[in-house]
């Protein structure tokens, strides 16, 4: 599974019975696709409505989905109504559901006198239209999928640095006498629904996932 969970809102694994509205829609679509395999499912790409064939079977292989990717008819749920990003058994796509589960702490809680070395900001990104895939190729991200007249949006939970230098010398709390430092956004790859001209497919795309401190030792002078 090629993703880190730095800063990811966590959720408890829940029984298969807790299927989402999307899963039901997909099951219905899948049954229809079996009887009429050529019927395309309309998908809207970057706001333009086009007929793109989305095989509902794409949603059946749920092994590789990250809790950082969400398909939902509404904006991402909040923790009070499931921003635990609850994912189903085997860590499937965290679709919107009515199931509620405990939410664990999503990023370090700093106590008095404790500081973060680098400062990050996290948001649900719903305006992703292009991305870089795992092969370094620019791909089009399927922003919305229309299934059985329900429009599902693809959201990504992304974390990036707020500043490359939280303090003048670089990262916070680093001995600047001996070390050069700066904060940088690191990435991971998550499975996302993407499209080329005709076909929708799952691809690993790169998203921002953490803000880390990069250190390099300062050259020491020899007298």
């Amino acid at each position: 599974e090629p993703y880190t969970d730095s800063n990811v809102p966590e959720g408890d694994s829940v029984p298969e019975a807790h299927w989402t509205k999307l899963q039901h829609s997909l099951d219905t679509a899948l049954r229809r696709a079996r009887s009429a395999p050529t019927a395309p499912i309309a998908a809207r790409v970057t706001g333009q409505t086009r007929n793109i064939t989305v095989d509902p079977r794409l949603f059946k292989k749920r092994r590789l989905h990250s809790p950082r990717v969400l398909f939902s008819t509404q904006p991402p749920p909040t923790s009070s109504d499931t921003l635990d990003l609850d994912f189903q058994a085997h860590g499937t796509i965290p679709f919107n559901r009515t199931h509620r589960s405990k939410r664990s702490s999503t990023h370090p809680v700093f106590h008095m006198g404790e500081f973060s070395v680098c400062d990050s900001v996290s948001v649900w990104v719903g305006d992703k239209t292009t991305a870089t895939d795992i092969k370094g190729k620019e791909v089009t991200v399927l922003a919305e999928v229309n299934i059985n007249n329900s429009v599902f949006r693809q959201y990504f939970f992304e974390t990036k640095c707020r500043a490359s230098n939280p303090v003048e010398s670089g990262c916070r709390g680093i001995d600047s006498k001996h070390w050069n430092s700066y904060c940088t956004t690191t990435h991971t790859f998550v499975k996302a629904l993407t499209t080329d001209e005709k076909q929708a497919a799952w691809r690993f795309i790169r998203i921002d996932t953490a803000c880390v401190c990069v250190l390099s030792r300062k050259a020491t002078r020899r007298g």
Epitope: N7, R44, T46, G47, Q48, P75, P76, T78, S79, S80, L83, T106, H107, D119, S120, V121, S122, V123, W124, V125, G126, D127, K128, T129, A143, E144, R153, Y155, E158, T159, R162
Partner: antibody
Framework: QVQLKESGPGLVQPSQTLSLTCTVS????????VNWVRQATGRGLEWMGG???????DYNSALKSRLTITRDTSKSQVFLKMHSLQSEDTATYYC????????????????WGQGTTVTVSA | DIQMTQSPASLSASLGETVTIECRAS??????LAWYQQKPGKSPQLLIY???TLHTGVPSRFSGSGSGTQYSLKINSLQSEDVASYFC?????????FGGGTKLELK
């Protein structure tokens, strides 16, 4: 430079439909998100909805049933339509830009129009 | 929806004083918070984004801080031109919501 300008009728009859236009310059609608925010006299700011750079829309759930936001990228215009207006919809209506995830300011609204005042009254 | 609770609703301060305005989110917003200043009869203007980053042209007497659900805006050495209403707003996800605002006046 970046500019947004709201236009529309100053007076709307109760139960009628409000149509506002936000004309933008200095940036592209296909690279930025545009939001509508309103403010009743002496009150706070209320986010109404917005259109993403990609063309998708999101709405304030309390207004969703009466609100439609569209755009015409070739004219650099964003439109707000709200039906069944009542006196409590009397407010100054602003359009505001946010640069989206790829901008340094993320989704903070970094440029605002001057606002247009709408009165709902018979 | 995430609720943003701002306090105080109004405050009076003297020139040169330090003023702090608080904003509490109903849940974690991961530092996706902005502060706006609105002078009487004018449009709101972005002051601070990403919790603590000053927008272009904003004087350094303004600063933002916080994390999780608790955020604050601090104005050091209050100037007469700082008389305005201040609003916090989250952009963690849609729908965006604003705090109720704080009206800052001079004593």
């Amino acid at each position: 430079q970046v500019q947004l300008k709201e236009s529309g009728p100053g007076l709307v009859q109760p139960s009628q439909t409000l149509s506002l236009t936000c004309t933008v310059s200095g940036f592209s609608l296909t690279n930025n998100n545009v939001n509508w925010v309103r403010q009743a006299t002496g009150r706070g700011l209320e986010w109404m909805g917005g259109v993403w750079a990609g063309g998708a829309t999101d709405y304030n759930s309390a207004l969703k049933s009466r609100l439609t936001i569209t755009r015409d990228t070739s004219k650099s215009q964003v439109f707000l339509k709200m039906h069944s207006l009542q006196s409590e919809d009397t407010a100054t209506y602003y359009c505001a830009r946010d640069g989206g995830y790829s901008s340094s300011t993320l989704y903070a609204m970094d440029a605002w129009g001057q606002g247009t005042t709408v009165t709902v009254s018979a | 929806d995430i609720q943003m609770t701002q306090s105080p609703a109004s405050l009076s301060a003297s020139l040169g004083e330090t003023v702090t305005i608080e904003c509490r989110a109903s849940e974690d917003i991961y530092n996706a918070l902005a502060w706006y200043q609105q002078k009487p009869g004018k449009s709101p203007q972005l002051l601070i984004y990403n919790t603590d980053t000053l927008h272009t042209g904003v004087p350094s007497r303004f600063s933002g801080s916080g994390s999780g659900t608790q955020y604050s805006l601090k104005i050091n050495s209050l100037q007469s031109e700082d008389v305005a209403s201040y609003f916090c707003q989250h952009y963690f996800h849609y729908p965006r919501t604003f705090g109720g605002g704080t009206k800052l006046e001079l004593k």
